[in-house]
Interface confidence: low
């Protein structure tokens, strides 16, 4: 599998993993105590035909072409988990590892 | 894991699995000897605020709202394979399991 | 239905602050980012930033970034606009607008409901 | 930042012509483009979206085109009530940025 990684700066216009860092403080997320922040990136561009398309089953829904499909979509294809300390709803500190935090890879599916 | 399930009658407007048989002798696939037909299904609609996201990192990026982020988009989260009897590349009679040929659930990711 | 009623015209002196408010109604408040753009008389649109009222995450546009705050009261579903250090060429009606984001693509959005507008006059 | 240049900035038109409204923008905006209406006194209103998409409740006789830099609104048949000013918008980038509007008027 690949796909391709972009910043700020690039000038891809192609589905490509962009560099996000989540900061709960900002968000007012205070339930969260550990990471404060976290490197998350964030996928975006146009999926044209058949670049990046992690399944088959993309490109033939593409050739069918049913009313309303839209096309395929820049999305995560592989993500990661992160560990994370926070309080429950029932104030207990919780530790855990919360899955597809992190975004590893971006693909149109 | 929840997903809404439309036909091309329904009125929703969100994200929702649709039927769609793909037909390989339609697209002229010769090489496909079985099966000639199958319901590979797709998903279609709007990703509103929370609905239907499949993953925290979702909603995360949609508050965080960096510059080109694509929010959610309608996109397969459960896909199951197929048996199929093809050619390969040197004309040999393959039979074999390819993954993600059909979509079982559909959500914003 | 969904609706956005703005505060009243304000005449304010250079230099001085306005406030605009922008009250919700009709839809969940919290899900959708809210717009301010202004026109000045006899003039264009201009954006002037958005926020994000689940969090209080805004963007502004550079050129008012040093003089504007948007904030939000997510108990009265009311977004607000604060323009400090006012001056003549601020005299313009100020929009609220919601952005209704339909959500297949970059910036898959539009602004489906609008404010009323609100005069706002800077005169000595 | 991106600048959209609308032309022409004003028109003359009779009820029952087709006319069509250009914005042009500094750069590619991948079709994220929006169409206004804005009559005196009134809040803009929106028309289409996504360059070519039309927004709930408006009638057909509004469509949009293009792609890349070059954007085109089109009414088919004026009516009355369509004479205002039209306004396009980008928000494929921060800041968003308007075209600098096109009055309609009657002829």
């Known amino acids: 599998d690949f796909g391709l990684d972009c910043d700020e700066h690039s000038t891809e216009s192609r589905c490509c993993r962009y560099p996000l860092t989540v900061d709960f403080e900002a968000f007012g997320w205070d339930w969260i105590i550990a990471p404060k922040r976290y490197k998350a990136n964030y996928c975006s561009g146009e999926c044209e035909f058949v670049f990046l398309q992690k399944y088959p089953h993309t490109h033939l829904v593409h050739q069918a072409n049913p009313r309303g499909s839209a096309g395929p979509c820049c999305t995560p294809t592989k993500m990661s988990p992160i560990n994370m300390l926070y309080f429950n709803g029932k104030e207990q500190i919780i530790y855990g590892k919360i899955p597809a935090m992190v975004v590893d890879r971006c693909g149109c599916s | 894991d929840f997903g809404l399930d439309c036909d091309e009658h329904s009125t929703e407007s969100r994200c929702c699995r649709y039927p769609l048989t793909v037909d390989f002798e339609a697209f002229g696939w010769d090489w496909i000897i079985a099966p000639k037909r199958y319901k590979a299904n797709y998903c279609s609609g709007e990703c509103e605020f929370v609905f239907l996201q499949k993953y925290p990192h979702t909603h995360l990026v949609h508050q965080a709202n960096p510059r080109g982020s694509a929010g959610p988009c309608c996109t397969p989260t459960k896909m199951s394979p197929i048996n199929m009897l093809y050619f390969n590349g040197k004309e040999q009679i393959i039979y074999g399991k390819i993954p993600a040929m059909v979509v079982d659930r559909c959500g914003c990711s | 239905q969904v609706q956005l009623v703005q505060s009243g015209a304000e005449v304010k002196k250079p230099g001085a602050s306005v406030k605009v408010s922008c009250k919700a109604s009709?839809?969940?408040?919290?899900?959708?980012?809210m717009h301010w753009v202004r026109q000045a008389p006899g003039q264009g649109l201009e954006w002037m930033g958005n926020?994000?009222?689940?969090?209080?995450?805004?963007n502004y546009n550079q050129r008012f970034k040093a003089r504007v705050t948007m904030t939000t009261d997510t108990s009265t579903s009311t977004a607000y606009m604060e323009l400090r250090s006012l001056r003549s060429d601020d005299t313009a009606v100020y929009y609220c607008?919601?952005?209704?984001?339909?959500?297949?693509?970059?910036?898959?959005?539009?602004?489906?409901?609008w404010g009323q507008g609100t005069l706002v006059t800077v005169s000595s | 930042d991106i600048q959209m240049t609308q032309s022409p900035s004003s028109l003359s038109a009779s009820v029952g012509d087709r006319v069509t409204i250009t914005c042009k923008a500094s750069?590619?905006?991948?079709?994220?483009l929006s169409w206004f209406q804005q009559k005196p006194g009134k809040a803009p209103k929106s028309l289409i979206y996504?360059?070519?998409r039309l927004v709930d409740g408006v009638p057909s006789k509004f469509s949009g085109s293009g792609s890349g830099t070059d954007y085109t609104l089109t009414i088919s048949s004026l009516q009355p009530e369509d004479f205002a000013t039209y306004y396009c918008?980008?928000?494929?980038?921060?800041?968003?940025?308007f075209g600098q509007g096109t009055k309609l008027e009657i002829k």
């Open positions: 926020i994000y009222p689940y969090n209080g995450v805004s």
């Open positions: 750069q590619d905006i991948n079709s994220y």
């Open positions: 996504r360059a070519n």
């Open positions: 918008l980008q928000c494929d980038e921060f800041p968003l940025t």
């Open positions: 009709g839809y969940s408040f919290t899900g959708y980012f």
């Open positions: 607008a919601r952005r209704y984001y339909y959500g297949t693509g970059p910036a898959d959005w539009y602004f489906d409901v």
